[in-house]
C-alpha cells in the first residue's frame, strides 16, 4: 500500500451567479471553500477503487468534483459518466499535485448518478468512485411559462423552466367571460408547445409537472370590446418577456393597427401582424407587440390604435422584484351563529400568488379572482361558525403577505365545572366574554339565592385556543362553604348559564346542570 | 456540538430482525447529513448505510442492501436502522456518524465529524 498515492477529493460548490464555471473545465473558479469528500479506499474490490462521500446537488446548481492527486511524475485519466467516457485534461497546482476536474453546470435529474475517474500514474493504476444525488425532490420547480415567437414562424411557443420537464399545453377559448372557466365546453385544450392559431378570445399557456400546474395568459387588448373603467395594467419583472396582442375585427380588410409606447412608434423587430378572414366574411387583425427581455424603460402605456376602432391602452409596469400589495393589519369580525359570512383579502401582486386559509393548525385551499380594476380577491366561506384565529398566507418567488382574522360568534355562555380539594373552577367560552357570579345554597337560601363574594378570582381570556377565549373563575374553597353546594353562573347579553357543584372532601364531584 | 447514543442492539438468530436508534442532541438534527458503520472484530469500520438530512435519498452497502433500510424523524432527532436477515457476518459493533454539511453524505469515514459510541449487534445461534 505505501505506492499508492495520496489523493483528496473535493466538492466545490459554485454560487449561481458564478460566470466564471465552466468557461474552462481544467481552471474552474472557486466559489466556496471545497468541502472534503474524504475518499476512502474500498474494502473487497478487485483493483485500486477510492471512494468519495456521496455528494448531494441542488436542482440548477454547479459543482465541480476535484481530485488532487499526491504522486510523483505525470499522470493521464479518463472520466467515465453512465457507460459514456469524458474528456479529462489533467494539470498541476503550486504543490505538484496533479488536479483533476469535473464541472457539473445547472444539475439536472439526468447529470445524477454514478462518476468514475480513471486515473493512470507512473506507478500504478487506481479508481475514484463519485455518487452524485439531486439533493431533494422538494427542490423540484414549477416556473410560470412565458412566451417566445417562433423563428421565422407565426407562431408562439410556449416555454417553462421547470424540473422535472413539465407537460405544456395551451388553453384556447373563443367566449367571453365566465364560459371561459377550465372545464367550460368552450374550451379547447391542445398539448404541445407551439401554437400557429393565435386569433382566439382567450389564450393561456399551462405547465405542469409533479408540483401542480401554472398558467400565463396571453395579454390582450380587444378593440372591440368595450374598454374596462379602469386601465388594465400588465406587471413584469426586469429580464421577463412583454407579450401583449391587440385584437380587432372589421367587416373588410380596410384597416390597419399600429402599437406606440408612450406616443411613439414601436421599433421594428417589437412586433408583428397576423390576419386571417372569420367564417362571416369579417376581417380579424392582430398586432402583437413583444419585447424578448423587458428593462425598466420599457414601463409605460402601450397603445393600439386602429383606422376603424377607438385606441385602447394597457400600462406596463416593469419591477425589479415581485411584490403582494395588502393590507396585514388584523381584523376582527363578531357575528351570530347563523349569520351568512366569509372573510376576504383583497389583494394585488405579481407573480400571482399562492396562498392557503387555516384554521386549527389545518389549510384550507384557497381561490383567487381577479377584478376588473387589476387587483384580486380571495374569500373563506368554510368557517363552519367556529370561533377563533383564521390565517391568510401568500406567497410567490419574492414575497410572502400573512393576514390575520379573527371570529367570534355570539352565543350565550357554557359552563363547565372542576373541582380539586382547596378551589372550584368553572369555564366558559361564550361571546361577549361572560361576567361570573357565585352563589351559595343552603337551608338559608334554597334557591341559591346567596352571593360569594370572598375567594372568587376571575381570570378572562385565560386560555386561548386557536384564537378562541375562554373565560373562567375560580373560588378558594373557604371553612364557611365546605360541605355546601354552590353554584357559579356566567352571563353576557345573550343569557346566563350555570353549574352546581358539592364541596365536600376530596374525591370526584359530582355537577347538577343547571340552565 | 452533537451527541449521539445508540440503542438496540443485542443478540440475534440468523434469519432474524433488528432496529437500532440514534438519539441526536444539540445542533439542529436536520440539518445535517447521518448513517450507520459497523466494525467486526479484528477488522476495519465499514460504511453501512446513510440518509440525507431531508430523508429523499438513502445509500447502502452492497453487503446490506435489500436486507437493511435507513430512515429518520427529524421531528423526533432520531435516526434507525432496521435489520432484516440478519447473517452471522453481520456480526459488529455498530456506529451512529453525523456529518457536517448537508451536501455531503456520510458514505465514508473521513467525513464524519461526529460518532456515537456503538452498539453491539450479535448474530448467533
Known amino acids: 500500500n505505501q505506492d499508492l498515492p495520496v489523493i483528496k477529493c473535493v466538492l466545490i460548490n459554485h454560487k449561481n451567479n458564478d460566470s466564471s464555471v465552466g468557461k474552462s473545465s481544467s481552471y474552474p473558479m472557486v466559489s466556496e471553500s471545497p468541502e472534503d469528500l474524504g475518499c476512502a479506499l474500498r474494502p473487497q474490490s478487485s483493483g485500486t477503487v477510492y471512494e468519495a462521500a456521496a455528494v448531494e446537488v441542488d436542482v440548477s446548481a454547479s459543482i465541480t468534483l476535484q481530485v488532487l492527486v499526491d504522486a510523483p511524475g505525470n499522470i493521464s485519466c479518463l472520466w467515465v459518466f453512465k457507460h459514456s467516457s469524458l474528456n479529462c485534461q489533467p494539470h498541476f497546482d503550486l504543490q505538484n499535485r496533479g488536479v483533476v476536474s469535473m464541472v457539473i453546470l445547472k444539475m439536472t435529474e439526468t447529470q445524477a448518478g454514478e462518476y468514475l475517474l480513471f486515473i493512470q500514474s507512473e506507478a500504478t493504476n487506481y479508481t475514484i468512485l463519485f455518487t452524485v444525488s439531486i439533493r431533494n425532490t422538494l427542490l423540484y420547480t414549477l416556473r410560470r411559462p412565458y412566451f417566445r415567437k417562433m423563428e421565422n414562424q407565426d407562431a408562439l411557443v410556449c416555454i417553462s423552466e421547470s424540473v422535472p420537464e413539465p407537460i405544456v399545453e395551451w388553453v384556447l377559448c373563443d367566449s367571453q367571460g365566465e364560459s371561459c372557466k377550465e372545464e367550460s365546453p368552450a374550451v379547447v385544450k391542445k398539448e404541445e408547445k407551439v401554437l400557429h392559431e393565435l386569433f382566439g378570445t382567450d389564450i393561456r399557456c399551462c405547465a405542469r409537472n409533479e408540483l401542480g400546474r401554472e398558467c400565463t395568459r396571453l395579454f390582450t387588448i380587444d378593440l372591440n370590446q368595450t374598454p374596462q373603467t379602469t386601465l388594465p395594467q400588465l406587471f413584469l419583472k426586469v429580464g421577463e418577456p412583454l407579450w401583449i396582442r391587440c385584437k380587432a375585427v372589421h367587416v373588410n380588410h380596410g384597416f390597419g393597427l399600429t402599437w406606440e409606447l408612450e406616443n411613439k412608434a414601436l421599433e421594428e423587430g417589437n412586433y408583428f401582424e397576423m390576419s386571417t378572414y372569420s367564417t362571416n366574411r369579417t376581417m380579424i387583425r392582430i398586432l402583437f407587440a413583444f419585447v424578448s427581455s423587458v428593462a425598466r424603460n420599457d414601463t409605460g402605456y402601450y397603445t393600439c390604435s386602429s383606422s376603424k376602432h377607438p385606441s385602447q391602452s394597457a400600462l406596463v409596469t416593469i419591477v425589479e422584484k415581485g411584490f403582494i400589495n395588502a393590507t396585514n393589519s388584523s381584523e376582527d369580525y363578531e357575528i351570530d351563529q347563523y349569520e351568512e359570512f366569509c372573510f376576504s383579502v383583497r389583494f394585488k401582486a405579481y407573480p400571482q400568488i399562492r396562498c392557503t386559509w387555516t384554521f386549527s393548525r389545518k389549510s384550507f385551499p384557497c381561490e383567487q379572482k381577479g377584478l376588473d380594476n387589476g387587483y384580486s380577491i380571495s374569500k373563506f366561506c368554510n368557517h363552519k361558525h367556529q370561533p377563533g384565529e383564521y390565517i391568510f398566507h401568500a406567497e410567490n418567488d419574492d414575497a410572502q403577505f400573512t393576514k390575520m382574522f379573527t371570529l367570534n360568534i355570539r352565543r350565550k355562555p357554557q359552563v363547565l365545572a372542576e373541582a380539586s380539594a382547596s378551589q372550584a373552577s368553572c369555564f366558559s367560552d361564550g361571546y361577549p366574554l361572560p361576567s361570573w357570579t357565585w352563589k351559595k345554597c343552603s337551608d338559608k337560601s334554597p334557591n341559591c339565592t346567596e352571593e360569594i363574594t370572598e375567594g372568587v378570582w376571575n381570570r378572562k381570556a385565560n386560555r386561548k385556543v386557536f384564537g378562541q377565549w375562554v373565560s373562567s373563575s375560580t373560588l378558594n374553597m373557604s371553612e364557611a362553604i365546605k360541605g355546601f353546594l354552590v353554584k357559579c353562573c356566567a352571563y353576557n347579553s345573550l343569557g346566563t348559564s350555570c353549574e352546581t357543584i358539592l364541596l365536600n372532601s376530596p374525591g370526584p364531584f359530582p355537577f347538577i346542570q343547571d340552565n | 456540538e452533537v451527541q449521539l447514543l445508540e440503542s438496540g442492539g443485542g443478540l440475534v438468530q440468523p434469519g432474524g430482525s433488528l432496529t437500532l436508534s440514534c438519539a441526536a442532541s444539540?445542533?439542529?438534527?436536520?440539518?445535517?447529513?447521518m448513517g450507520w458503520f459497523r466494525q467486526a472484530p479484528g477488522k476495519e469500520r465499514e460504511f453501512v448505510a446513510a440518509?440525507?438530512?431531508?430523508?429523499?435519498?438513502?445509500y447502502y452497502a452492497d453487503s446490506v442492501k435489500g436486507r437493511f433500510t435507513i430512515s429518520r424523524d427529524n421531528s423526533k432527532n432520531t435516526l434507525y436502522l432496521q435489520m432484516n436477515s440478519l447473517r452471522a457476518e453481520d456480526t459488529a459493533v455498530y456506529y451512529c456518524a453525523a456529518g457536517g454539511s448537508t451536501r455531503v453524505v456520510v458514505t465514508t469515514t473521513p467525513v464524519v465529524k461526529y460518532w456515537g459510541q456503538g452498539t453491539l449487534v450479535t448474530v448467533s445461534s
Open positions: 444539540g445542533r439542529t438534527f436536520s440539518s445535517y447529513a
Open positions: 440518509i440525507s438530512w431531508s430523508g429523499s435519498n438513502t
